[in-house]
Interface confidence: medium
Amino acid sequence: FKVATPYSLYVCPEGQNVTLTCRLLGPVDKGHDVTFYKTWYRSSRGEVQTCSERRPIRNLTFQDLHLHHGGHQAANTSHDLAQRHGLESASDHHGNFSITMRNLTLLDSGLYCCLVVEIRHHHSEHRVHGAMELQVQTGKDAPSNCVVYPSSSQDSENITAA
């Protein structure tokens, strides 16, 4: 399987909420012995490999934000810790995997990475990640709502998030 990032850039005004999204593509094994570990973290555009550096999102590490579930299940992060920081990660039955960040500030700007690990315990593991940029703007040049820019593999028109 692969991870697709429908949008490579999110431009949002300060104070807005945004949902960053990754999507699993290709055949996904949903057998009993397969589990998925999904998480989010901040990173920087490394010269060698994007997403190789793992930094916290609002002081929450990738361990704090992780989802771990069987191949056929949906999942949400444990609400307490994440929601206190205005964060929630979720995964649905259709391969969509997201993190919602509430009340954005300029400090939230940066590169965000999703990581998915397909695990057949003691047999194999397959790791894939996706990256996207979040720009939080303030002042007269800031958009009134979040504007998302599709990844290059998709239609290049701007799409305004609902």
Epitope: Q63, H68, I119, S124
Partner: antibody
Framework: EVQLVESGGGLVQPGGSLRLSCAAS????????MGWVRQAPGKGLEWVGI???????YYASWAKGRFTISRDNSKNTLYLQMNSLRAEDTAVYYC??????????WGQGTLVTVSS | DIQMTQSPSTLSASVGDRVTITCQAS???????LAWYQQKPGKAPKLLIY???TLASGVPSRFSGSGSGTEFTLTISSLQPDDFATYYC????????????FGGGTKVEIK
């Protein structure tokens, strides 16, 4: 009979090397994850590393660079190569088979003593 | 590093007592990947419980396991003479890399 038998332990000087073997019988080593776990005298269990079915090998952070796990499927044997040994590596070393989600089959262990 | 913390480290009990041992992980463990072992002096560990609550083959029903997330428990409902031993929890983690972590052990001794 399904069993694991470790060998290769003994006395070695600090800075020295040792290779432990774990001979499997009654099953095919290549079909299972195989791990090494050690236990210092009077202490608890400490994970060393594992080779999973796909061939990926993982180590405890302290073992990276000094310890190497390998397997020889034709001999049905698992190995642990230990280099730059220190006094704190003194322990009984167990090999263990990954059964489903856990270690279900263990060897009897082999004692490694690092001392001058 | 990931830590598995067991408590108590030593437990004095009598035959017939109900005994509870707890294991706390420094990060969430998928319950399928949590196991308990029993070890007697000079012997290799023996698997008691896997997937947090499933009894291994041949293990008496007085042993039970429970818990999820970061908190797990091993309970012996009525301690028997053969149960005086050291018990270890073990969890597997895949992030950031594969790690098997063992708890420090709980020695159950005769009161």
């Amino acid at each position: 009979e399904v069993q694991l038998v470790e060998s290769g332990g003994g006395l070695v000087q600090p800075g020295g090397s040792l290779r432990l073997s774990c001979a499997a019988s009654g099953f095919s080593l290549s079909s299972y994850a195989m791990g090494w776990v050690r236990q210092a005298p009077g202490k608890g269990l400490e994970w060393v590393g594992i080779i999973i079915v796909s061939g990926n090998i993982y180590y405890a952070s302290w073992a990276k660079g000094r310890f190497t796990i390998s397997r020889d499927n034709s001999k049905n044997t698992l190995y642990l190569q230990m280099n730059s040994l220190r006094a704190e590596d003194t322990a009984v070393y167990y090999c263990a088979r990954g059964d489903g989600y856990t270690y279900g089959l263990w060897g009897q262990g082999t004692l490694v003593t690092v001392s001058s | 590093d990931i830590q598995m913390t067991q408590s108590p480290s030593t437990l004095s009990a009598s035959v017939g007592d109900r005994v509870t041992i707890t294991c706390q992980a420094s990060q969430s463990v998928y319950s399928r990947y949590l196991a308990w072992y029993q070890q007697k002096p000079g012997k290799a560990p023996k698997l008691l419980i896997y997937s947090a609550s499933t009894l291994a083959s041949g293990v008496p029903s007085r042993f039970s396991g429970s818990g999820s997330g970061t908190e797990f428990t091993l309970t012996i409902s009525s301690l028997q003479p053969d149960d005086f031993a050291t018990y270890y929890c073990q969890g597997t983690f895949y992030i950031p890399d594969y790690i098997d972590g063992f708890g420090g052990g709980t020695k159950v001794e005769i009161k």
